[in-house]
Interface confidence: low
């Protein structure tokens, strides 16, 4: 399996990964919204998807990965696996992954998944904008 880098990737590599992730994320979110109409966003789920200690903000892969591993059995496994593969490339070796529990209640679970997908898409937009506004 892919070994996480021990150093920060160059911006050009990060940009390629973000470009790979954006359509995957958007497609997953749109498919889920079509399939699960009327499911509200959960205000108790917070994806800490950006690092607060770097400028421009960096995608916090170690914080995001556990959520996608958690929702993998409950969503489109093929797309989720592609997202995990890309996020793995961004993950630093020394960064621990936290454990994530999916709500047991079906409705809460759907709301949880929707929120993760929405927040992840928003994060990708934010990182992509900051990468494009910085030096190429």
């Amino acid at each position: 399996s892919h070994m996480a880098p021990t150093h920060q990737l160059p911006p050009s590599d990060v940009r390629k990964i973000i470009l790979e992730l954006q359509p995957l994320s958007r497609g997953l979110l749109e498919d889920y919204q079509k399939k699960e109409t009327g499911v509200p966003e959960s205000n108790r789920t917070l994806l800490l998807c950006l690092t607060s200690d770097s400028q421009p903000p960096r995608l916090n892969s170690s914080a995001i990965l556990p959520y996608f591993r958690a929702i993998r059995p409950l969503s489109d496994k093929n797309i989720i696996d592609k997202i995990i593969e890309q996020l793995d490339k961004l993950k630093f070796q020394h960064e621990p992954e936290t454990e994530i529990s999916v709500p047991a209640d079906t409705f809460e679970c759907k709301s949880f998944i929707l929120t993760i997908l929405q927040q992840f898409s928003a994060c990708l937009e934010s990182v992509f904008k900051s990468l494009n506004s910085g030096p190429q």
Epitope: L46, T98, S101, P103
Partner: antibody, heavy 118, light 111 residues
Framework: EVQLVESGGDLVKPGGSLRLSCVAS????????MSWVRQAPGKGLQWVAT????????YYPDNIKGRFTISRDNAKNTLYLQMNSLRAEDTAMYYC???????????WGQGTLVTVSS | EIVMTQSPASLSLSQEEKVTITCKAS??????????MHWYQQKPGQAPKLLIY???NLEAGVPSRFSGSGSGTDFSFTISSLEPEDVAVYYC?????????FGQGTKLEIK
Amino acid sequence: EVQLVESGGDLVKPGGSLRLSCVASGFTFSNYGMSWVRQAPGKGLQWVATISYGGSYTYYPDNIKGRFTISRDNAKNTLYLQMNSLRAEDTAMYYCVRGYGYDTMDYWGQGTLVTVSS
Amino acid sequence: EIVMTQSPASLSLSQEEKVTITCKASQSVSFAGTGLMHWYQQKPGQAPKLLIYRASNLEAGVPSRFSGSGSGTDFSFTISSLEPEDVAVYYCQQSREYPWTFGQGTKLEIK
């Protein structure tokens, strides 16, 4: 109904040890992070320790790190706080608290009193 | 660590009056547009109870007269119309980063 019942509080001499327990019921214990928060007599609240739902991750403030250890036994629905090298300033009511999400403490037990005095 | 400065330390108001308590953090406690600030009520001889989580979300079962707002470093907690059962100490708490820290509390009394 969510219930958190603490026990193990006692009078102990400075330098002594104590183990607090918290038995949880009314929810799936293994799905939730848990914390200990304390309150010295007549004072405010102070966060003591947090443990992730599976027990892999633990967090402490600097003044407690190395002296206290938070742990859990999901099979027994029980949270623990092992307290070593106790000081007079550790005298407080210790509350067991359930976590929701990664950051919110939503249910509190009634507390167990720890008194450190010679 | 993030220091939480809560004010006022105590408050004595009449029934049905509006109550406002503020909490100022020494640095931003917001993340991705969400204020990681929570408010608790502690009645005499009881354990604290969560009222508001993540700045403005009302905890289930909590009366709608309680509300919260704010972002960044400045947050406020409001009781729209004070009731006798609201006599308690109120605490703010941040969970933006470890160590989690609380405000020193506001003691609320009825005149």
